[in-house]
Each structure stands twice: as structure tokens, then as C-alpha cells.
Amino acid sequence: ALDTNYCFRNLEENCCVRPLYIDFRQDLGWKWVHEPKGYYANFCSGPCPYLRSADTTHSTVLGLYNTLNPEASASPCCVPQDLEPLTILYYVGRTPKVEQLSNMVVKSCKCS
């Protein structure tokens, strides 16, 4: 699987999940988020050669097409597959509020 366990331990040029840390205050200007100060959002990048974690028959065909026709612009894209939520803490006045935000952390990628 093209997940963090594999991708973070290997120098992989093809489609893989890459580490990306986002600081809420410095990177996004969201000064009101109390905890965490930031988190690893991660992102997907890298080429999608034939049969690399193909998500659908279409992406398999597209990958083969691109392999046999290298000059073609059509090829599968490296996109998030599994995402996890992130829990944040902020204050409404002096009242703490905890929210779980869905699909915030990329854990694995796929070619689609």
C-alpha cells in the first residue's frame, strides 16, 4: 500500500504520500485554533506508471495507454486514498470547544 508506513521509509519517486506539516497560525493565519498548533496534513505526489496502485479499470487502462504512448498527456493522477480526522480545540469566548474535522490527514495515496 502507498501509505505512510511505506512511503515515509522509502525514497519513492512514483506516486506516494509525502509528509507536509501545516502550522495553523503561521501557514494558514488561523490564530484562533488553540490545539494542536499544527499537524501533518501530508499530500500525494509522483507519477503513476502502469499498474501502480491503480484505483479503477479506467486508471489501469490509462496507465497502460501512457506507457505505450509516452508523448500523451493523459495519465492517472496520484490522489489521496485514505484520510483520517483531526481533533481541534478552540475557545468560544472562554468556553472550550472540541471538534473532530473529517478528512484532514492523508494516510495513503492511489493512482486514479
Epitope: 494558514l28 493565519g29 488561523w30 490564530k31 484562533w32 478552540y90 475557545y91 468560544v92 469566548g93 472562554r94 468556553t95 470547544k97 471538534e99 474535522l101
Partner: antibody, heavy 121, light 111 residues
């Protein structure tokens, strides 16, 4: 230039609902909380609630008894306020206002021009 | 809810004089070293505009004739050398507690 442009005046019957829009431009919509404030004729300002457009988190003033619903469309940078079960006491000018940015509850540095909602049978 | 009481309800001032508006909160609006109190002016037929942020910080583009002071429960907005353009209703607002609340307003007019 930061701009908040609200939809036009509305006339509604008692018991109906009204939905007011607030189209923003000149800043990053998902970076700031959007507040809604109402002002009855000749009266002061009442905070109704707020929404964080990036993921739709909301905080409401309990005085509106769950009748208000705030939403946001990030594709058009537009915020919406819907008020249900309208009554005569809801006749007011409704404002959207951008939060200052340092806190969830905060001062409001840019305001829409206001939308007059009239309730009449 | 924190109740904000403004005095006086209305104020008539001669041009070039100084006007003072008070705002008293029903409980302290101070936290983490800040006073969570702000001031607005609503000119006739217009939307409110922010004048003072966090009790004493002048908002960008606002005349330095406006100044704010105070902490805890008692706050004051001062307008020096009052001009015709200063007429309208002034509101204080707190955000130290949910829900955010405003004062009832002080109407300033020129003599």
C-alpha cells in the same frame, strides 16, 4: 478591497422562512469567521451566530431558539443565514460581518450593507 | 450573558469639543492580559464600522481623534475635536464570553 454584498430586502409571511446571502470578495473566504448580526428598527445590535466556512463549524446565540441556520459555499465565497418560523419580532435589518481573525468570537472589521426583512400577513 | 450598559444614552456636543462615552460590563471582560472590548460607530443609514479593538487599539484608517481606555468592567471611548462626521450611534461590544453582546448604543449629535 474587502466587500460583503448582501441579497435584497425580503417580505415574508408569519411562520415562513427567509434565507439571506452574503457574497464576499477581496479576501480569503475560508480564513475568517463570518458573523450575523441583526438590528430591529430603532434598536441596538444582536449577535445571532457565526460560521467558519472552511469546514462549516458554527456557534449560535441561544436567544434565537434554534431558528437560525448558518451555511457557507466556499466555491462562491458566499455565506447564508436562514431564519425560520418568522414572527413580527423578527422585523429587522440583518448584517453579515467578518470576524477580525484573532479569536473565534471577535470584533467585526467588515460589514455587509444589511438586508431588511419584513414580516407581514 | 454579559450585559453591556452604555452611558449616556444620548449626547449633544459642540464642534471641536471632546465627547466621552462609557460602557460598563456586568462582569469582567478581561482574560489572558487582554480586555475583550471593542467600539463601533454606526452612521445614519450605514452599517456599523469598527473604531477601537481590544479596548484601546485604533483600527486601521480610523482618525486618531478616537481613543479607548479601561479594563475589567469599565471602559471609555473619547472623541476629541468632534466633527459633524462623527454623528451617529456608538456601540461597545464584548467577546470575552459566549454569546457576544453589544451595548444598547449612545447617540451622538452636534449642538
Amino acid at each position: 478591497e474587502v466587500q460583503l454584498v448582501q441579497s435584497g430586502a425580503e417580505v415574508k409571511k408569519p411562520g415562513a422562512s427567509v434565507k439571506v446571502s452574503c457574497k464576499t470578495s477581496g479576501y480569503t473566504f475560508i480564513k475568517y469567521w463570518m458573523n450575523w448580526v441583526r438590528q430591529a428598527p430603532g434598536a441596538g445590535l444582536d449577535w445571532m451566530g457565526q460560521i467558519f466556512p472552511a469546514w462549516g463549524s458554527t456557534n449560535y446565540n441561544e436567544m434565537f431558539e434554534g431558528r437560525v441556520t448558518l451555511t457557507a459555499d466556499t466555491s462562491t465565497s458566499t455565506a447564508y443565514m436562514e431564519l425560520s418560523s418568522l414572527r413580527a419580532g423578527d422585523i429587522a435589518v440583518y448584517y453579515c460581518a467578518r470576524g477580525y481573525g484573532n479569536y473565534a468570537l471577535d470584533a467585526m472589521d467588515y460589514w455587509g450593507q444589511g438586508t431588511l426583512v419584513t414580516v407581514s400577513s | 450573558d454579559i450585559v453591556m450598559t452604555q452611558t449616556p444614552p444620548s449626547l449633544s456636543v459642540s464642534p471641536r469639543e471632546t465627547a466621552s462615552i462609557s460602557c460598563r460590563a456586568s462582569e469582567s471582560v478581561d482574560s489572558y492580559g487582554n480586555s475583550f472590548m471593542h467600539w463601533y460607530l454606526q452612521k445614519p443609514g450605514q452599517s456599523p464600522q469598527l473604531l477601537i479593538y481590544l479596548a484601546s487599539n485604533l483600527e486601521s484608517g480610523v482618525s486618531d481623534r478616537f481613543s479607548g481606555s479601561g479594563s475589567g468592567t469599565d471602559f471609555t471611548l473619547r472623541i476629541s475635536r468632534v466633527e459633524a462626521n462623527d454623528t451617529g450611534v456608538y456601540y461597545c461590544q464584548q467577546n470575552n464570553e459566549d454569546p457576544l453582546t453589544f451595548g444598547q448604543g449612545t447617540k451622538l449629535e452636534l449642538k
